[in-house]
Interface confidence: low
């Protein structure tokens, strides 16, 4: 294999034939970002998932999926060294494989979930190239406590992680949607308080707003400086 090829961090190509599989190549020890474009209108309101094909006729085993609340799909979720984030307006699902290892190579799928069904957005073949410098940067070992196996990968879990300095927390289109929701909530809250004061009511007695914005009591939405992945 020519030296130039080893220096390529990412190489995307379409395989010939009916498989229609996209190949993503990454270098061992480094990060690989996989993108799965989709029709944002067709898949509106649907959560997404990243799974590994276990066999020719076997199931696709879930590795990680987007946030349980679709409106919070922009929040990056982790399972071990694999992260997923969804730009629901732009129609791009992004999967990041940190500290890529040879055993990460294989066939995967980006999926759109609806009920118990799953539509395949893209079939992805991940290939791992040897590190031309043959070194391992300790900075790439994000979660040393995590097993490198996919044992119990169907059991989804997230790792809380503070956003790194300079890291974009989520796509611009999604942040606009979130800010719009927050702005509307503030306007409604202010209006309710103003109405309560006007009618001489106690501030706590105003009717609850019907605008949910996907907010669940179990999730505390924090402002950007303190934002953490759920």
């Amino acid at each position: 294999m020519e030296p130039l090829r080893l220096l390529i961090l990412l190489f995307v190509t379409e395989l010939s034939g009916a498989h229609n599989t996209t190949v993503f190549q990454g270098v061992a020890g480094q990060s690989l970002q996989v993108s799965c474009p989709y029709d944002s209108m067709k898949h509106w309101g649907r959560r997404k998932a990243w799974c590994r094909q276990l066999g020719e006729k076997g199931p696709c085993q879930r590795v990680v999926s987007t946030h349980n609340l679709w409106l919070l799909s922009f929040l990056r979720r982790w399972n071990g060294s694999t992260a997923i984030t969804d730009d629901t307006l732009g129609g791009t699902l992004t999967i990041t494989l940190r500290n890529l290892q040879p055993h990460d190579a294989g066939l995967y799928q980006c999926q759109s979930l609806h009920g118990s069904e799953a539509d395949t957005l893209r079939k992805v073949l991940v290939e791992v190239l040897a590190d031309p410098l043959d070194h391992r940067d300790a900075g790439d070992l994000w979660f040393p406590g995590e097993s490198e196996s996919f044992e119990d990968a169907h059991v989804e879990h997230s790792i809380s992680r503070s956003l790194l300095e300079g890291e974009i927390p989520f796509p611009p289109t999604s942040i606009l949607l979130l800010l719009a929701c927050i702005f509307l909530i503030k306007i409604l809250a202010a209006s309710a308080l103003w109405a309560a004061a006007w009618h001489g009511q106690k501030p706590g007695t105003h009717p609850p707003s019907e605008l949910d914005c996907g907010h669940d009591p179990g999730y505390q939405l924090q402002t950007l400086p303190g934002l953490r992945d759920t």
Epitope: M1, R5, S16, G17, H19, V23, Q25, Q53, L54, G55, E56, G58, Q101, P102, H103, A105, G106, L107, E127, L129, A130, S147, E148, S149, F150, E151, D152, A153
Partner: antibody, heavy 119, light 107 residues
Framework: QVQLQESGPGLVKPSETLSLTCTVS????????WSWIRQPPGKGLEWIGS???????NYNPSLKSRVTISVDTSKNQFSLKLSSVTAADTAVYYC?????????????WGQGTLVTVSS | EIVLTQSPATLSLSPGERATLSCRAS??????LAWYQQKPGQAPRLLIY???NRATGIPARFSGSGSGTDFTLTISSLEPEDFAVYYC?????????FGGGTKVEIK
């Protein structure tokens, strides 16, 4: 159905390079991954390395410095080169197809070829 | 690398008897485990993949079970052609590794 056939010299001198070729028939090499596995006489199996038709390779760390696997899609063949051989490299060498994923089980296998390292 | 330990090293049984072969991994390999049969002078033949799925053309008397670190290959009723060496192989961790083998011989 896919069949694999190993070919190459049965005797190699110490310090020389062992060269074997695997010819795939009954199917295209331009899909799946392909591996070399060896078995010293009376011992267990050891995976050597694998290659994809695109040329992407992975080797067993214990042999990495001495192994080169290449592919020739036009001939539907892939090859193994093992340099600086010693008597410890005497074994039956098998080529095999990965049943599915690049990291996967092996099926089918070639019938194997015995390579003896001796002066 | 993952070490696979097979036991027993040798199993002496008669045709018609039940054979139970064990494979233990040094750490969890989930269900990413295969079993092979090898007869003298022949290449290994895939019997089971993904711990319990029979490969094409493999008789129903062969079955695999287990997950994590402990796996079992069971031959419900031994046929004369089943006397051979059996290997397990994991394929989740790099590099893929094989167990040392269990020889099933005629008692």
């Amino acid at each position: 159905q896919v069949q694999l056939q190993e070919s190459g010299p049965g005797l190699v001198k110490p310090s020389e390079t062992l060269s074997l070729t695997c010819t795939v028939s009954g199917g295209s090499i331009s899909s799946y991954y392909w591996s070399w596995i060896r078995q010293p006489p009376g011992k267990g199996l050891e995976w050597i390395g694998s290659i994809y038709y695109s040329g992407s390779t992975n080797y067993n760390p214990s042999l990495k410095s001495r192994v080169t696997i290449s592919v020739d899609t036009s001939k539907n063949q892939f090859s193994l080169k093992l340099s600086s051989v010693t008597a410890a490299d005497t074994a039956v060498y098998y080529c095999a197809r990965h049943g599915w994923d690049r990291v996967g089980w092996f099926d089918p296998w070639g019938q194997g070829t015995l390579v003896t390292v001796s002066s | 690398e993952i070490v696979l330990t097979q036991s027993p090293a040798t199993l002496s049984l008669s045709p018609g008897e039940r054979a139970t072969l064990s494979c233990r991994a040094s750490q969890s390999v989930s269900r990413y485990l295969a079993w092979y049969q090898q007869k003298p002078g022949q290449a290994p033949r895939l019997l089971i993949y993904d711990a319990s799925n029979r490969a094409t053309g493999i008789p129903a008397r062969f079955s695999g079970s287990g997950s994590g670190t402990d796996f079992t290959l069971t031959i419900s009723s031994l046929e004369p052609e089943d006397f051979a060496v059996y290997y397990c192989q994991q394929y989740i961790f790099w590099p893929p590794t094989f167990g040392g083998g269990t020889k099933v011989e005629i008692k």
